[in-house]
């Protein structure tokens, strides 16, 4: 009789990524005996939950039960029934819910625990939901995407797993775009930091790495374009705002009241003398940029080099991987090429915002509005923060690759925080030895 | 091990308040939320509220206008605060824990106090 | 307020015996039901979650089922320790809600 294999021992996990636009449910899965082996997790499941993000809920908390069913209905559907029970479930909140917190912690608490008794309320081991911090995002992204690009192997591999994978063992750096904060996360060339608070020690799979991160809270894409308008309006002569950074022939009405709900445009509030504005665009990239670049204060920096608003920032170093809405709205773009130099970017954007709104609306036809409005910003943004803000040049333009997935796992640092949380990222390289069920000597 | 204890008296005059103290042991009320549940023969069992462990608190809509729940989280304790009391408000009154983070079902319970409401 | 409904107020078994004990929700609960033991003088013992899913330490005779608004809990070899109460719990919507009781007796 022929040897049958013995059914792998498959472990999950759930890591839900509330972010501030909208939150998604991520299953991951790995082989049990291979736990500590690096690039073993892979993703098998996203889940985008429908509707905004939970800091939107704060005067509708009854209605968050509602809003996880059906994604946490899917998780029942994908994870065998017999492995409910040991499969652990993290929320980690990001910068939507570090803004409500600063608004109100008693709001912010509410929200977090009604999040709580939803996600308990099924058979899974739930772990709990939190605020994580701007510096944990940018370190999880980071592991998850050199764990992902096998960069903790210390295996060489004769082949390389993904098209921009070099056959070293140097890490990839991280940039994180979302709705309301940014990160950067790289290994500096320089060990010693000019600014402890950036500086973060890990010791992984046997090899210490000393990382520079940092969160840009408020400057997340969404957050941005409010302050930008907010920043605008106070120079508009009348309720109506000329703006470069949206189509020609596009309008929009704009509540006073909403442009200064967030934080973030605190420092540009003032009274004005309507309650109301009207967007209409005029699709200039030129200004848009110009316009942008008054978002990031350089004229201040109690440091060798700072990015933007005194933050340090030591010389870039190595590759990018550029994620999330970095991705989004590149890949939307059609920019993700590796072959696409920064010039050639910029002159598309160029091209891009000056399209009349009746023609963009006709030429994408399937998407939102809402979203459609806004690429036109959101590219100019992008090249704004990276080559401004991160101080990346035309030359080093080619070391940013825009990343949506590695092996099927999108970038982001869902992946990374349920590695550190369920211990899967060994200090020490684990020993290859031929004993089962990983016993190690 | 895991364990509640309810303290509070065993008499209360209708129209008076009950003030009842659940201490824990074994798990922090930072962790977990913590249920109160009450007893008795005419009405069986009937969920009364919850603290969760942030603070926030939810109340059966029938006890809301006379109900409160407050924790110290340092000293581990659970605070039950009714006003208003009749005779139909005898029973035995328990804390429960949620079995997970903030579920709404319970893996272990307090032995319970009883709770008579007379004059 | 979402009614459980346990039909049998009382249920006579014998050691060795199976038996299975009911719940009916009067609106759809999904699978948010748990069960608890009573024993006389006793505080509940919680043995089920989300309608199947067993605590550690409780014996696997007991066994849970059901999803909308019919629920079972089967005892399997009942066991004289067995004499209890049970009592079926919708977690589906506040007010949370307990079922009536089925007192379990043994011959």
């Known amino acids: 009789t022929q040897n049958k294999a013995l059914p792998e021992n498959i472990k999950y996990g759930i890591v839900l990524d509330a972010g501030s636009s909208h939150t998604s449910l991520y299953i991951y899965k790995w082989p049990a005996e291979k736990e500590n082996d690096t690039g073993v997790v892979h993703q098998v499941e996203e889940c985008r939950v429908k509707g905004p993000g939970i800091s939107k809920y704060v005067q509708k908390v009854n209605e968050i039960g509602i809003y996880l069913t059906d994604c946490m209905e899917r998780a029942r559907e994908v994870i065998p029934r017999s492995q409910h029970q040991e499969t652990p479930v993290y929320l980690g909140a990001t910068a939507g819910m570090r803004l409500l917190r600063m608004e109100s912690e008693e709001l912010a608490d509410r929200v977090l625990d009604v999040v709580e008794r939803s996600l308990s309320n099924y058979p899974f081991d739930f772990q709990g939901a939190r605020i994580i911090t701007g510096q944990e995002e940018g370190a999880y992204g980071w592991i998850t995407i050199n764990y992902l690009l096998g960069k903790f192997s210390q295996k060489t591999r004769w082949f390389s797993i993904v098209p921009y994978e070099t056959n070293n063992q140097e890490t990839f750096g991280a940039l994180d775009l979302g709705g309301a904060s940014t990160q950067i996360t790289f290994v500096p060339q320089n060990q010693t930091t000019e600014s402890p608070d950036n500086a973060l020690q890990f010791r992984l799979y046997g090899k210490d790495y000393n990382v520079y991160t940092h969160s840009f809270l408020c400057y997340g894409k969404d957050q941005a374009l409010w302050q930008k308008l907010a920043k605008d309006i106070q120079v508009a002569s009348n309720e109506i705002l000329r703006d470069p950074c949206f189509h020609p022939g596009y309008k929009k009405v704009v509540n006073v009241s909403d442009l200064y709900k967030t934080p973030c445009t605190k420092r540009f509030e003032m009274t004005l003398p309507f309650q109301q504005f009207e967007i209409q665009g005029i699709g200039n990239y030129q200004q848009c940029h110009q316009s942008v670049l008054e978002l990031f204060n350089t004229s201040y920096c109690p440091y060798s080099q700072c990015a933007f608003n005194g933050i340090f920032l030591p010389p870039l170093q190595g590759d990018f991987g550029a994620f999330s809405a970095f991705y989004f709205v590149m890949n939307f773009l059609n920019l993700t090429s590796e072959k696409v130099s920064q010039e050639k970017v910029t002159e598309m954007m160029k091209k891009f915002c000056s399209q009349p709104w009746e023609e963009i609306k006709t030429s994408y036809a399937g998407v939102k509005e809402k979203y459609l409005s806004e690429y036109c910003f959101s590219g100019t943004y992008i090249l704004s923060l990276l080559l401004q803000g991160y101080h990346f040049t035309a030359d080093s333009w080619e070391h940013i690759h825009f990343i949506g997935k590695i092996q099927g796992s999108d970038a982001g640092w869902t992946l990374g925080y349920m590695l550190n949380l369920t211990n899967m990222i060994p200090a020490e390289q684990p020993l290859s030895t031929p004993l089962s069920h990983s016993t190690y000597v | 091990q895991v364990q509640l204890k309810e303290s509070g008296p065993s008499l209360v005059q209708p129209s008076q308040s009950l003030s009842i103290t659940c201490t824990v042991s074994?798990?922090?009320?930072?962790?977990?939320?913590v249920h109160w549940v009450r007893q008795s023969p005419g009405k069986g069992l009937e969920w009364l509220g919850v603290?969760?462990?942030?603070?926030?608190?939810d109340y059966n809509a029938a006890f809301m206008s006379r109900l409160s729940i407050t924790k110290d989280n340092s000293k581990s304790q659970v605070f039950f605060k009714m006003n208003s009391l009749q005779a139909d408000d005898t029973a035995i009154y328990y804390c429960?824990?949620?079995?997970?983070?903030?579920?709404?079902?319970?893996?272990?319970w307090g032995q319970g106090t009883t709770l008579t409401v007379s004059s | 307020d979402i009614v459980m409904t346990q039909s049998h107020k009382f249920m006579s078994t014998s050691v060795g015996d199976r038996v299975s004990v009911t719940c009916k929700a009067s609106?759809?609960?999904?699978?948010?039901v748990a069960w608890y033991q009573q024993k006389p003088g006793q505080s509940p013992k919680a043995l089920i979650y989300?309608?199947?899913y067993r605590y550690s330490g409780v014996p696997d005779r007991f066994t849970g089922s059901g999803s909308g608004t019919d629920f079972t809990l089967t005892i399997s070899n009942v066991q004289s320790e067995d004499l209890a109460e049970y009592f079926c719990?919708?977690?589906?919507?506040?007010?949370?809600?307990f079922g009536t009781g089925t007192k379990l007796e043994i011959k």
């Open positions: 429960a824990k949620t079995a997970v983070v903030a579920g709404d079902y319970f893996d272990y």
């Open positions: 074994g798990f922090s009320l930072t962790n977990y939320g």
């Open positions: 603290i969760l462990r942030r603070g926030s608190t």
């Open positions: 609106q759809n609960v999904g699978t948010n």
């Open positions: 989300s309608a199947s």
């Open positions: 719990q919708q977690y589906n919507s506040y007010p949370l809600t």
